[in-house]
């Protein structure tokens, strides 16, 4: 399954929207930095496309869930958030189309399940951090920066998969 070129453009638009969402000076938030333990190894080049698609899907689904909460709606600009949802929704559709075409439909490798679980735990850590920080503006900015970084790393994986073919 070849992800459409529009998928790459959508990924770039998503990053641009995340960048635009910033609401306060980041310099006031330095002391709120946190190690969320992004499972970078789960996005390594050792994976075949069949194993990678569901992991990328999980990553985007979790980002969608994170930014769909009422706490998120209160933190960010509504117009930008709506555009952000649209981009993520389109990317989820692209990835789901690949799965439907047969990629990863056969017996799910244990390694892939472990990777999906690692991504879920990563987002659980993010959610816990926000809760502990009482969803403060700085906590949201730290999370936004983290999502930009992790989304960018996973997008780079998509690009490397495309260029390998």
């Amino acid at each position: 399954c070849d992800l459409p070129q529009t998928h790459s453009l959508g990924s770039r638009r998503t990053l641009m929207l995340l960048a635009q969402m910033r609401r306060i000076s980041l310099f006031s938030c330095l002391k709120d930095r946190h190690d969320f333990g992004f499972p970078q190894e789960e996005f390594g080049n050792q994976f075949q496309k069949a194993e990678t698609i569901p992991v990328l899907h999980e990553m985007i689904q979790q980002i969608f869930n994170l930014f769909s909460t009422k706490d998120s709606s209160a933190a960010w600009d509504e117009t930008l958030l709506d555009k952000f949802y649209t981009e993520l929704y389109q990317q989820l559709n692209d990835l789901e189309a690949c799965v439907i075409q047969g990629v990863g439909v056969t017996e799910t490798p244990l390694m892939k399940e472990d990777s999906i679980l690692a991504v879920r735990k990563y987002f659980q850590r993010i959610t816990l951090y926000l809760k502990e920080k009482k969803y403060s503006p700085c906590a949201w900015e730290v999370v936004r920066a983290e999502i930009m970084r992790s989304f960018s790393l996973s997008t780079n994986l998509q690009e490397s998969l495309r260029s390998k073919e």
């Epitope: 310099f27 002391k31 946190h34 983290e146 970084r149």
Partner: antibody, heavy 121, light 107 residues
């Protein structure tokens, strides 16, 4: 390969203005902040200030606030440090270094080679 | 501002020695502490970040420990190329501040 390349050494007279540069390459320039550090002859490191190239937001050390201006041009991946009126006490080596912003990643992991500024009448 | 105090300001050691440099912050900074090495005429080089994480490409003889206000840089077995000046730096809050440096010289 990540690189920060600074402009060459400068010799200036007191009262003159100066703008030195730091060009980033090999990474996404707007994803990292750029900090500036001063080292006077035979002395230690002093943090001057920092810029977020994505929107040119800046923060300064109180010791340097109003003495220097930090700016950036993201279209050419370059950060700047400038003086409107140099003093003899500005004679020093100036370094730029990249900072990961709010991400949990190594601080100041890449540095420029330094720009030596000499101010003498 | 957070003050960073390094000790000693200089030390003499021999190749193979175990060297320890300490850094104290004037207030708690969690683990937001970095260590740099600088050789004459060169830019500083990051060794340790977030108190104990070894920067990529740095030899494992370098290690960092501590949290809160007290931190330590240890060189387990000093090598000829390790003779340099070492700086700690807090990255907890602005303004970022450096220690005054520790010069490691050949005995």
């Amino acid at each position: 390969e990540v690189q920060l390349v600074q402009s060459g050494a400068e010799v200036k007279k007191p009262g003159e203005s100066l703008k030195i540069s730091c060009k980033g390459s090999g990474y996404s320039f707007t994803s990292y902040w750029i900090g500036w550090v001063r080292q006077m002859p035979g002395k230690g490191l002093e943090w001057m200030g920092i810029i977020d190239p994505s929107d040119s937001d800046t923060a300064y050390s109180p010791s340097f606030q109003g003495q220097v201006t930090i700016s950036a041009d993201k279209s050419i991946s370059t950060a700047y440090l400038q003086w409107s009126s140099l003093k003899a006490s500005d004679t020093a080596m100036y370094y730029c270094a990249r900072h990961p912003g709010l991400n949990w990643a190594p601080d100041f992991d890449y540095w420029g080679q330094g720009t030596l500024v000499t101010v003498s009448s | 501002d957070i003050q960073m105090t390094q000790s000693p300001s200089s030390l003499s050691a021999s190749v193979g020695d175990r060297v320890t440099i300490t850094c104290r912050a004037s207030q708690s900074i969690g683990s937001a502490l970095n260590w740099y090495q600088q050789k004459p005429g060169k830019a500083p080089k990051l060794l340790i970040y977030f108190a104990s994480s070894l920067q990529s490409g740095v030899p494992s003889r370098f290690s960092g420990s501590g949290s809160g206000t007290d931190f330590t840089l240890t060189i387990s077995s000093l090598q000829p190329e390790d003779f340099a000046t070492y700086y700690c730096q807090q990255s907890y809050d602005f303004p970022l501040t450096f220690g005054q440096g520790t010069k490691v010289e050949i005995k």
